[in-house]
């Protein structure tokens, strides 16, 4: 009797279990009682990444420089092109269809993780003992200057945005 289910990498059509086309190939004709499934390779600008019965291959993604995109990995007949963003930019989504400039960390915040082509800058508040007085996409929080090691004393306390101000020790107290 005609099958109602087929093996892995097969599909059911007209009561026949037909072989799926392998990745990198598209379906030209279904199998029949007397013939195999016929498949053709995708053209150079196209791909199919699964065992399939698609009659058309998918176009490779275009990494549009006008959107700040560049090719990270060229597509093959079995894989799509992977785009990434140009220096100073990162993807707005996982599919990386457009890019935006990296965020800068404001004064009082330092860079916890530098941005990549696919992820934005991660900032963190400068903890006690550290400061950042610049807006930057690269600089971490810096430790306050240690006045003691310079044989100086703190004249003005540091904040998360400013370093301590050191000064000479008061000689009257000596």
């Amino acid at each position: 009797e005609p099958p109602t289910a087929c093996r892995e990498k097969q599909y059911l059509i007209n009561s026949q279990c037909c072989s799926l086309c392998q990745p990198g190939q598209k379906l030209v004709s279904d199998c029949t009682e007397f013939t195999e499934t016929e498949c053709l390779p995708c053209s150079e600008s196209e791909f199919l990444d699964t065992w399939n019965r698609e009659t058309r291959c998918h176009q490779h993604k275009y990494c549009d420089p006008n959107l700040g995109l560049q090719v990270q990995q060229k597509g093959t007949s079995e894989t799509d092109t992977i785009c990434t963003c140009e220096e100073g930019l990162h993807c707005t989504s996982e599919s990386c269809e457009s890019c935006v400039p990296h965020r800068s960390c404001l004064p009082g915040f330092g860079v916890k993780q530098i941005a990549t082509g696919v992820s934005d800058t991660i900032c963190e508040p400068c903890p006690v003992g550290f400061f950042s007085n610049v807006s930057s996409a690269f600089e971490k929080c810096r430790p306050w200057t240690s006045c003691e090691t310079k044989d100086l004393v703190v004249q003005q306390a540091g904040t998360n945005k400013t370093d301590v101000v050191c000064g000479p020790q008061d000689r009257q107290r000596a």
């Epitope: 072989s19 030209v28 004709s29 279904d30 029949t32 009682e33 007397f34 013939t35 195999e36």
Partner: antibody
């Protein structure tokens, strides 16, 4: 229901070309399948002559050398057989077939 | 070419009794995908061949379940579990794995 019907002259002179047409109904010959010509000499077995595929490409039985040509007319949903330089040995019932469905056959006699 | 050899060439069977026909190929009919394209046909007197079995063991639509096919590689068998009067005719195996397609020489089934 798929149906095939052969047509053509029943008598052909030696050294001439035998021409037969198969008209298909119930299925488009350009959709899928291989469309075959098969013959059966009187009192003998079946011999595959060749096919034309749904995409128009061909395959022929090497035993018929280069005498056989199968073509098609998709607008009429027909495919045709030409067999050149015929001899008495080409006298047979000629069938067109999709292999699951067959025509009823047409008898061709080669005689002067 | 794949030469198809059928045995026996004729058999006479009492109605209700089983019958078995063998078809042997000179080369394996299994293709690279693991599929085997071997058909069985019955040609009743004065008629076109009719498909019984395709891909070794699949009954064509409308074929009674007393007909079954089996085998692999080079050896194939058609079995009729209980022969009926309407089963008389010539049985052919046909391989369509390799070009040229080739038929067995036929097995004539008669009723005792």
């Amino acid at each position: 229901e798929v149906q095939l019907q052969e047509s053509g002259p029943g008598l052909v002179k030696p050294s001439e070309t035998l021409s037969l047409t198969c008209t298909v109904s119930g299925y488009s010959i350009s959709s899928n399948y291989y469309w075959n010509w098969i013959r059966q000499p009187p009192g003998k077995g079946l011999e595959w002559m060749g096919y034309i595929r749904y995409d128009g490409s061909n395959n022929y039985n090497p035993s018929l050398k280069s005498r056989v040509t199968i073509s098609r007319d998709t607008s009429k949903n027909q495919f045709s057989l030409k067999l050149s330089s015929v001899t008495a040995a080409d006298t047979a019932v000629y069938y067109c077939a999709r292999l699951d469905y067959w025509g009823q056959g047409t008898t061709v006699t080669v005689s002067s | 070419d794949a030469v198809m050899t059928q045995t026996p060439l004729s058999l006479s069977v009492t109605p209700g009794q089983p019958a078995s026909i063998s078809c042997r190929s000179s080369q394996s009919l299994e293709n690279t995908n693991g599929n085997t394209f071997l058909n069985w046909y019955l040609q009743k007197p004065g008629q076109s061949p009719q498909l019984l079995i395709y891909r070794v063991s699949n009954r064509f639509s409308g074929v009674p379940d007393r007909f079954s096919g089996s085998g692999s590689g080079t050896d194939f068998t058609l079995k009729i579990s209980r022969v009926e009067a309407e089963d008389v005719g010539v049985y052919y195996c046909l391989q369509v794995t390799h070009v040229p397609f080739t038929f067995g020489q036929g097995t004539k089934l008669e009723i005792k």
